[in-house]
């Protein structure tokens, strides 16, 4: 539970978080666990702590080992352990079995490709994208934020896929790889004016002033996967990233589910700390695909804090 | 020095109701996650509520779960439990204690304790 | 919910003596365990947490051991004031405590 296996490349950027997790006032130390060695917090050196994340840049083969992290509250000290292996580059094309992420899969139409760990770095777009080590080039492909789009997916699209980015730190620049592999499911598919699964329309979604609240838009719109199909929020009939309050805040990225062979997408609003004004809003699920678009409405209503278990 | 005083225990019938409280000092009240432990005459620990530090978690024990209501009044340093349809099983102890480190919604250990105060439920 | 034995139920033992205590979980707690010594009339006190880190101001005699399913208190040599009744509690899903050990002076 609090240990957690990372790898990376050798004279590549690597970033890992202490799996243990505490408030954010709370310190947190950094040690090579098989010397007990302290990790330096100064930026200057290759290898240094960051609060929760432990910083490689670059990373070595003899980094490779177990590091822990204690974090400190005023009376309590917890430890987590980051499991760290740094490889050599590989010569050839070929990844090895060990530097691969979770698997994707997807069919037809079109797909995302979701680079790993890159929520840990600081990057910025676009995404270089590599399948079997050949920058990936034409109008299907589309790097987009931090995944890659392929149109008309083909069984012959599967294989290992690399994203490519660069992390900066204080001006400095380092190169991050992360590679999964991608299946495709071969299905015939169809297209259908969208339907909203949740939430009903006119829905009244009670929440607790000063907790944090989930509004999930769940849409589907036809069987296999869909071309131009979206799900998404918004505010008094603005989006949500053009509506300017940041307690209020989109997933990123959208959770594609085939429920029944049904091909639907989740988008989830994330209220933190629900607040009176919030009751005020209007909040649209909008789903649209090349058929339409359909909108269902929510408001929220106050409850009083009830009973609920783990 | 972090202090915690339970009161409002008594005698009561059964189907009755109580309100307890607890009232905290010696550190930043709305930080910590609170929490109601219960004792029985001669008898363990049972753990009864949780509370988040801003009031908008709860957790309650099956035993309890739709009988007690947990509350807490960040600007009064104050923590609650009210109780009601009581029933004989209820007679016990009851502890306040502070979760010292729970983000919210999670678990700890409990560092400080009340002195307790006894709840018999008797006709 | 998460079921923690606590074993002996009772340990009659001389001051000095060693103590060995047993706390078994139904499922795997990982390291979210604690030990509180309680003594009558008075409220719990933390011993241990995490499974094997003393909390403030408990002596070294008091050590914690364990992982996953299986977990240990030892106290090394009992004093006078350690005879007291000992309780676990795990945190890994909401909050549950063992039944307790009684130390009770042989």
């Known amino acids: 539970k609090f240990s957690k296996q990372s790898w990376g490349l050798e004279n590549e950027a690597l970033i890992v978080r202490c799996p243990r997790q505490g408030k954010p006032s709370y310190t947190v130390d950094w040690y090579y666990s098989q010397t007990n060695k302290s990790i330096p917090t100064q930026e200057r050196n290759r290898v240094f702590a960051s609060g929760q994340l432990l910083k490689f840049l670059p990373a070595a083969v003899a980094d490779s080992g177990i590091y822990t992290c204690i974090v400190r509250s005023p009376t309590f000290n917890r430890t987590g352990y980051a499991n760290v292996t740094i490889y050599k580059k590989q010569s050839d094309c070929n990844v090895p079995d060990y530097l691969m992420y979770s698997t994707v899969s997807g069919s037809e139409k079109n797909s995302k490709i979701y680079c790993p760990t890159i929520d840990l770095y600081n990057w910025t777009a676009p995404l270089e994208w590599f399948k079997n080590c050949q920058a990936l080039q034409g109008s299907r492909y589309r790097a987009h934020k931090s995944f890659l789009v392929i149109d008309n997916v083909m069984t012959e699209d599967a294989g290992d896929y690399t994203c490519k980015f660069i992390h900066n730190e204080n001006g400095a620049n380092y190169s991050v790889t992360a590679t999964r592999s991608f299946t495709v499911k071969d299905e015939q598919g169809f297209s259908l004016f969208p339907v909203i699964g949740a939430p009903a329309q006119n829905e009244i979604k009670e929440v607790e002033i000063g907790k944090n609240a989930n509004l999930t838009c769940s849409a589907c719109f036809g069987k296999g996967t869909q071309f131009l199909a979206a799900v998404l929020w918004q505010l008094n009939g603005t989006k949500i990233t053009d509506f300017g309050e940041p307690r209020i805040q989109q997933e990123e990225g959208q959770n594609q589910s085939f429920s029944n062979g049904l091909a639907c997408l989740d988008m989830v609003l994330r209220i933190a700390d629900v607040k009176e004004e919030d009751l005020l809003l209007q909040y649209d699920c909008l789903a649209l695909n090349l058929h339409g678009l359909r909108r269902h409405t929510v408001r929220l209503s106050r409850k009083n804090p009830i009973d609920h278990h783990s | 020095e972090v202090q915690l005083l339970e009161s409002g225990g008594g005698l009561v019938q059964p189907g009755g109701s109580l309100r307890l409280s607890c009232a905290a000092s010696g550190f930043t009240f709305s930080d910590d996650a609170m929490i109601w432990v219960r004792q029985a005459p001669g008898k363990g620990l049972e753990w009864v509520s949780y509370?988040?530090?801003?009031?908008?978690?709860?957790y309650y024990a099956d035993s309890v779960k739709g009988r007690f209501t947990i509350s807490r009044d960040n600007s009064k340093n104050t923590l609650y439990l009210q109780m009601n349809s009581l029933r004989a099983e209820d007679t016990a102890v009851y502890y306040c204690?502070?979760?010292?480190?729970?983000?919210?919604?999670?678990?700890?250990?409990?560092?400080?304790w009340g002195q307790g105060t006894l709840v018999t439920v008797s006709s | 919910e998460i079921v923690l034995t606590q074993s002996p139920a009772t340990l009659s033992l001389s001051p000095g003596e060693r103590a060995t205590l047993s706390c078994r979980a139904s499922q795997s707690v990982d390291d979210d365990l604690a030990w509180y010594q309680q003594k009558p009339g008075q409220a719990p006190r933390l011993l241990i947490y995490d499974a094997s880190n003393r909390a403030t101001g408990i002596p070294a005699r008091f050590s914690g051991s364990g992982s996953g399913t299986d977990f240990t208190l030892t106290i090394s040599s009992l004093e006078p004031e350690d005879f007291a009744v000992y309780y676990c509690q795990q945190y890994n899903d909401a909050i549950t405590f063992g039944q307790g050990t009684k130390v009770e002076i042989k």
């Open positions: 204690a502070r979760d010292p480190w729970s983000t919210e919604g999670s678990f700890f250990v409990l560092d400080y």
């Open positions: 509370i988040g530090g801003n009031g908008g978690t709860t």
